[in-house]
């Protein structure tokens, strides 16, 4: 006899990285017929939804109008059908960005390299932080973590055309509070024609569309849970 229902899916719209004072909606998708959903923050009850009519609703939304460091952290949700509760969802790490300062991102030997060259990114922030994050813009939000007193280095090793794209970095004050994003650095990797044509390049964005990137990146993936890429989320843990 089944003692618990399958776990629901949890995600953030438009993105799990939320600039401070901006709004975000945490979505929880369970089953039709669920009479109650509970959202938990850092292990404690945060909000409750009792959808009506339950038989016509399988997803609820918890709105956060004003993102700040107190709202940043780990969320999970559960739902109930009759008296039977579900397993808890995976953890959603909600991150507040645009805190305090802006780091500087540089790349060595330079932004234009040949396939096979060793490339290292450097992220520098003079204020009190020791953790840095390097993100490649695109649908899968590749995230790398680095450490250093005022600067972290991110060696990519010998690059291929798959490394092409636009990069930004953040200083991290804790796992869920990040700095403003750095200015973008576009890495151009040249190789032979065959490699270039086969390279799985992520979509990139002009320098002034970082806000749009935050609003659009992974939204489609978050709604299609079979494709959801947990790379960034897992790196936060």
């Amino acid at each position: 006899q089944q003692q618990t229902l399958p776990k629901p899916f949890i995600w953030a719209e438009p993105h799990f990285m939320v600039p401070k004072e901006k709004q975000v909606t945490i979505c929880c998708q369970g089953n039709y017929g669920a009479v109650e959903y509970q959202l938990h923050f850092e292990g404690s009850l945060f909000a409750v939804d009792r959808p009506k009519p339950p038989e016509r609703i399988n997803k609820v939304q918890f709105y956060i109008p004003d993102m700040n460091s107190r709202m940043a952290g780990q969320y999970s949700c559960i739902y109930r059908v009759g008296e039977l509760w579900s397993e808890p969802s995976n953890l959603l790490d909600l991150v507040v960005t645009e805190m305090y300062d802006t780091p500087t991102l540089s790349v060595h030997p330079g932004p234009e390299v040949i396939s096979g060259e060793k490339v290292t990114f450097y992220c520098r922030l003079d204020t009190a932080t020791s953790m840095f994050l390097l993100l490649k813009e695109g649908r899968s939000s590749h995230v790398q973590r680095g450490y250093g007193k005022v600067q972290a280095e991110f060696p990519l090793g010998p690059v291929t055309t798959a490394h092409r794209g636009t990069y930004r970095c953040f200083g991290s004050y804790n796992n869920h509070a990040w700095s403003f994003p750095s200015e973008p650095v576009k890495l151009l990797v040249t190789g032979d024609i065959e490699n270039t044509s086969l390279a799985p390049e992520d979509p990139t964005f002009p320098a002034d569309t970082w806000g749009t990137y935050l609003l659009t990146t992974e939204t489609g993936l978050q709604k299609d849970h079979a494709l959801w890429d947990h790379t960034a989320q897992n790196l936060l843990r």
Epitope: F41, L45, F46, A47, V48, F62, Y63, D66, R70
Partner: nanobody
Framework: EVQLVESGGGLVQPGGSLRLSCAVS????????MGWFRQAPGKDREFVAA????????YYADSVKGRFTISRDNSKNTAYLQMNSLRAEDTAVYYC???????????????????????WGQGTLVTVSS
């Protein structure tokens, strides 16, 4: 400027009843989830009850379930907490609170965490004693 003003507190004997009111001005009250919290002397603030903006969902702390009833009148911009079968351990300052932001809240959602609330009243003291 947002203002939340509680009233209705006072001294009551164990087993008695009180009705607290919370009048809200400066916000579009009718689309905002509301909550009641309390803080007893020397203790942390704790959740008491919450209500969705449509009144379709209410939620209570286990300690008050079956004794307290939260309600609201959107036409009067007022939320209420009806407290029956009061006990000595209900003695506390009671605060009403409203969530922040715009009008995008689901009609059936309530918030139980104090951190979810942006605006707070000054509190009204409820003393249960014989």
């Amino acid at each position: 400027e947002v203002q939340l003003v509680e009233s209705g507190g006072g001294l009551v004997q164990p087993g008695g009843s009180l009705r607290l009111s919370c009048a809200v001005s400066g916000r579009t009250f009718s689309r905002l989830p509301m909550g009641w919290f309390r803080q007893a002397p020397g203790k942390d603030r704790e959740f008491v009850a919450a209500i969705s903006w449509s009144s379709s969902t209410t939620y209570y702390a286990d300690s008050v379930k079956g004794r307290f009833t939260i309600s609201r009148d959107n036409s009067k911009n007022t939320a209420y907490l009806q407290m029956n079968s009061l006990r000595a351990e209900d003695t506390a300052v009671y605060y009403c609170a409203a969530v922040g932001g715009s009008l995008d809240y689901s009609a059936t959602v309530v918030y139980t965490a104090a951190r979810a609330y942006a605006d707070w009243g000054q509190g009204t003291l409820v003393t249960v004693s014989s």
